[in-house]
Interface confidence: low
């Protein structure tokens, strides 16, 4: 006989990185027929929702209208069908951003490179922080951590065209409180070095900057619950 139900999926909309004083919704998707969902924050019960009618609903939303550092941390959810409880979801790391300062992101040797080059990102923030995070935007929402007194180095090693994309960095004051995002840097990787002639002397950084760093539903990220689960779980480990 089954002792627990499968764990639910947990994710944040529009994103797990939430600017301070902005709103965020934590979503928990279990099974149809679940009569109760519990949201836990840092190991303690945070909120409860009882969907009506339970047989037609398999997802609940917990709304946070005003994000701040006290609300940032690790969330998980569970649900109940009858008297049977589910396994807890994976942990969702909810991060408050736009704290204090804005770092500077630079890339060496430049934003336009060729396959085989060794590329390094540098994230600099003069205020007291020792952890930095580099994010490549896109479906994987890949995050790297780096350490340094005022600057962290993120060596990508010899790049391939898979490294193409837009990167931003944050300074981290603690695991769940990050700085404002840096301006984006778009890394362009052209084909094999053996077939590429020298480019002009002076690389220029891309002029386009995004109005917001929050990923929108157009990216499809929020729809991919398993991916969000995976991203959130591995973000700060």
């Amino acid at each position: 006989q089954q002792q627990t139900l499968p764990k639910p999926f947990i994710w944040a909309e529009p994103h797990f990185m939430v600017p301070k004083e902005k709103q965020v919704t934590i979503c928990c998707q279990g099974n149809y027929g679940a009569v109760e969902y519990q949201l836990h924050f840092e190991g303690s019960l945070f909120a409860v929702d009882r969907p009506k009618p339970p047989e037609r609903i398999n997802k609940v939303k917990f709304y946070i209208p005003d994000m701040n550092s006290r609300m940032a941390g690790q969330y998980s959810c569970i649900y109940r069908v009858g008297e049977l409880w589910s396994e807890p979801s994976n942990l969702l790391d909810l991060v408050v951003t736009e704290m204090y300062d804005t770092p500077t992101l630079s890339v060496h040797p430049g934003p336009e490179v060729i396959s085989g080059e060794k590329v390094t990102f540098y994230c600099r923030l003069d205020t007291a922080t020792s952890m930095f995070l580099l994010l490549k935007e896109g479906r994987s929402s890949h995050v790297q951590r780096g350490y340094g007194k005022v600057q962290a180095e993120f060596p990508l090693g010899p790049v391939t065209t898979a490294h193409r994309g837009t990167y931003r960095c944050f300074g981290s004051y603690n695991n769940h409180a990050w700085s404002f995002p840096s301006e984006p840097v778009k890394l362009l990787v052209t084909g094999d070095i053996e077939n590429t002639s020298l480019a002009p002397e002076d690389p220029t950084f891309p002029a386009d900057t995004w109005g917001t760093y929050l990923l929108t539903t157009e990216t499809g990220l929020q729809k991919d619950h398993a991916l969000w689960d995976h991203t959130a779980q591995n973000l700060l480990r």
Partner: antibody, heavy 120, light 107 residues
Framework: QVQLVQSGAEVKKPGSSVKVSCKAS????????INWGRQAPGQGLEWIGE????????YYNEKFKAKATITADKSTSTAYMELSSLRSEDTAVYFC?????????????WGQGTTVTVSS | DIQMTQSPSSLSASVGDRVTITCRAS??????LNWYQQKPGKAPKLLIY???RLHSGVPSRFSGSGSGTDFTFTISSLQPEDIATYFC?????????FGGGTKVEIK
């Protein structure tokens, strides 16, 4: 065209310090790494360290960490290397060199060299 | 540190000869190997980067090959203006290190 112009020859007493400059022109100074190296009489080249003028980040050869301090002034597009506690074995030609456009760690343009002679 | 061993340390050849210099790294450096030319009293000049890529303005008689630990630099037809010392340099791991140099003279 790209040019790196170094300061003139120096004669120094043992125990003193010297600061060599490298003025860059013909390209965007903050986009490229400046390396420093040296060549003792009749010897090969040794890499001392490098600086990213855009961010001020330094890397040093462990051998020269206590000897050399590399800085850059973005406003004048000039890189500097200060050598302290000079000894006779620091007598050498010191070069600055720009690391190339690509991340292949080649030095594509070099200064003309600055001779530093340490003698009592 | 990665040691770069260059051979021969000097050579003498006639104008028009094919000249070959080798450079061996103490560990795998992939293709991050560069070659420079230095004439007496002058700064080095970059000739070849990433093993085989010719720097802009460098004559095509200069070429490079190799991978991993063993590399070769070739002048296909030696010219009088090629009299110089040639250095290899690894760009795989800091500290960047140079070979001891090969002095090329005309017979």
């Amino acid at each position: 065209q790209v040019q790196l112009v170094q300061s003139g020859a120096e004669v120094k007493k043992p125990g003193s310090s010297v600061k060599v400059s490298c003025k860059a022109s013909g390209y965007t100074f903050t986009d490229y790494v400046i390396n420093w190296g040296r060549q003792a009489p009749g010897q090969g080249l040794e890499w001392i360290g490098e600086i990213y003028p855009g961010s001020g980040t330094n890397y040093y050869n462990e051998k020269f960490k206590a000897k050399a301090t590399i800085t850059a002034d973005k406003s004048t597009s000039t890189a500097y290397m200060e050598l302290s506690s000079l000894r006779s074995e620091d007598t050498a030609v010191y070069f600055c060199a720009r690391r190339g456009r690509y991340g292949l760690y080649a030095m594509d343009y070099w200064g003309q060299g600055t001779t530093v002679t340490v003698s009592s | 540190d990665i040691q770069m061993t260059q051979s021969p340390s000097s050579l003498s050849a006639s104008v028009g000869d094919r000249v070959t210099i080798t450079c061996r790294a103490s560990q795998d450096i992939s293709n991050y190997l560069n070659w420079y030319q230095q004439k007496p009293g002058k700064a080095p000049k970059l000739l070849i980067y990433y093993t085989s890529r010719l720097h802009s303005g460098v004559p095509s008689r200069f070429s490079g090959s190799g991978s991993g630990t063993d590399f070769t630099f070739t002048i296909s037809s030696l010219q009088p203006e090629d009299i110089a010392t040639y250095f290899c340099q690894q760009g795989n791991t800091r500290p960047w290190t140079f070979g001891g140099g090969t002095k090329v003279e005309i017979k």
